[in-house]
Interface confidence: low
């Protein structure tokens, strides 16, 4: 799916109001262990592509994220603010139903959600610098900040 035509401001608002809190709730109770940030994104559509991938594509050691509250809200937000998104997700939904539901939050899942938080923050931080203009191409302008 091409996220270029999404309403980024509406997605930002949804993230701040609900999704962010659910991500933090998922991470709560974890020890202060650093997870290496291996996933990054350079602009808003790219961030949403990476967010979608990490949220909805099961991985061998973390197959259950798609059923979490933050994932359901992410899906609803993308369906609401990205034209045609829901139509592309029929196959993905079928795959999700087959995904194993783990009762235990594995460290791998925590790592994945930690990555997701970083991607969402990056999405937020690229948003306002780029309002009313095309995505920055100059590396010096592609700061993670800001921002709001």
């Amino acid at each position: 799916y091409d996220f270029t035509n999404c309403d980024f401001q509406k997605i930002e608002a949804d993230y701040l109001r609900t999704i962010s809190k659910d991500l933090i709730t998922y991470m709560s109770g974890t020890k202060s262990t650093d997870f290496n940030n291996t996933v990054s994104c350079s602009n808003r559509p790219h961030c949403l592509t990476e967010i979608q991938s990490l949220t909805f594509n099961p991985t061998p050691r973390c197959a259950s994220l798609a059923k979490e509250m933050f994932a359901r809200k992410t899906k609803a937000t993308l369906a609401l603010w990205c034209p045609g998104y829901s139509e592309t997700q029929i196959n993905a939904t079928q795959a999700m139903k087959k995904a194993r539901k783990s009762k235990v939050t594995t460290n791998k899942c925590l790592e994945q959600v930690s990555q997701l938080l970083g991607l969402w923050r990056r999405f937020i931080r690229t948003l306002l610098k780029q309002q009313g203009s095309s995505d920055y191409k100059d590396d010096d302008d592609k700061h993670h900040h800001h921002h709001h």
């Epitope: 990054s40 948003l127 800001h146």
Partner: antibody
Framework: EAQLVQSGAEVKKPGSSVKVSCKAS????????MHWVRQAPGQGLEWIGA????????SYNQKFKDRATLTVDKSTRTAYMELSSLRSEDTAVYYC?????????????WGQGTTVTVSS | DIVLTQSPATLSLSPGERATLSCRAS??????????MHWYQQKPGQPPRLLLY???NLGSGIPARFSGSGSGTDFTLTISSLEPEDFAVYYC?????????FGQGTKLEIK
């Protein structure tokens, strides 16, 4: 409990550089923006810049872009702020601060501050 | 840069009184219907302490006597009934547009 502990006070000569450290504990260092703010004696707060430890990306207040350098060492969970070409007006308390968890841009944890005095 | 102007510069009140502090931005700090204005309290020799985020949300551990309102360019911090520990300097901060900026502060002193 999330905590930021900064290095001790520094006295520097004009034209020299200073490097202030900020050691984090009690939270996942690599997923929070770390900011630097300074406060001259009897004055208000002034933002210097921010760094995202996860990938080292930085953002600077243009006023400090040529003189301030923000870095992190993830292995020691420490953020650094180096300010070069010091002048007397750089005399201030320098704070590191953690940005909130939600991307809303407020500072919920602050270091205790490091006093930097620039004097000949 | 967005300039934040706080008023009054100094406010002299007695414990038990109501305090109203103002912060005016040179341009809107709103985005997506949210106001990215935050308030801090600072006491001598201490770092600032978050009071309110996004104009009206209480920071962790902040007493309910503190409240905030406003949107766009005009924001208000209200302390309903002053306690002795409330006398300090208060700063507003915006993060809607680079660079992040603070107001010059309002000093709340005992009358």
């Amino acid at each position: 409990e999330a905590q930021l502990v900064q290095s001790g006070a520094e006295v520097k000569k004009p034209g020299s550089s200073v490097k202030v450290s900020c050691k984090a504990s009690g939270f996942t260092f690599s997923t929070y923006n770390m900011h630097w703010v300074r406060q001259a004696p009897g004055q208000g707060l002034e933002w210097i810049g921010a760094i995202y430890p996860g990938n080292g990306e930085t953002s600077y207040n243009q006023k400090f872009k040529d003189r301030a350098t923000l870095t992190v060492d993830k292995s020691t969970r420490t953020a650094y702020m180096e300010l070069s070409s010091l002048r007397s007006e750089d005399t201030a308390v320098y704070y590191c601060a953690r940005e909130d968890d939600y991307g809303e841009g407020y500072f919920d944890v602050w270091g205790q501050g490091t006093t930097v005095t620039v004097s000949s | 840069d967005i300039v934040l102007t706080q008023s009054p510069a100094t406010l002299s009140l007695s414990p038990g009184e109501r305090a109203t502090l103002s912060c005016r931005a040179s341009e809107s700090v709103d985005s997506s219907g949210l106001s990215f204005m935050h308030w801090y309290q600072q006491k001598p020799g201490q770092p600032p302490r978050l009071l309110l985020y996004r104009a009206s949300n209480l920071g962790s551990g902040i007493p309910a006597r503190f409240s905030g309102s406003g949107s766009g360019t005009d924001f208000t911090l209200t302390i309903s009934s002053l306690e002795p520990e409330d006398f300090a300097v208060y700063y507003c901060q915006q993060i809607n547009t680079d660079p992040l900026t603070f107001g010059q502060g309002t000093k709340l002193e005992i009358k």
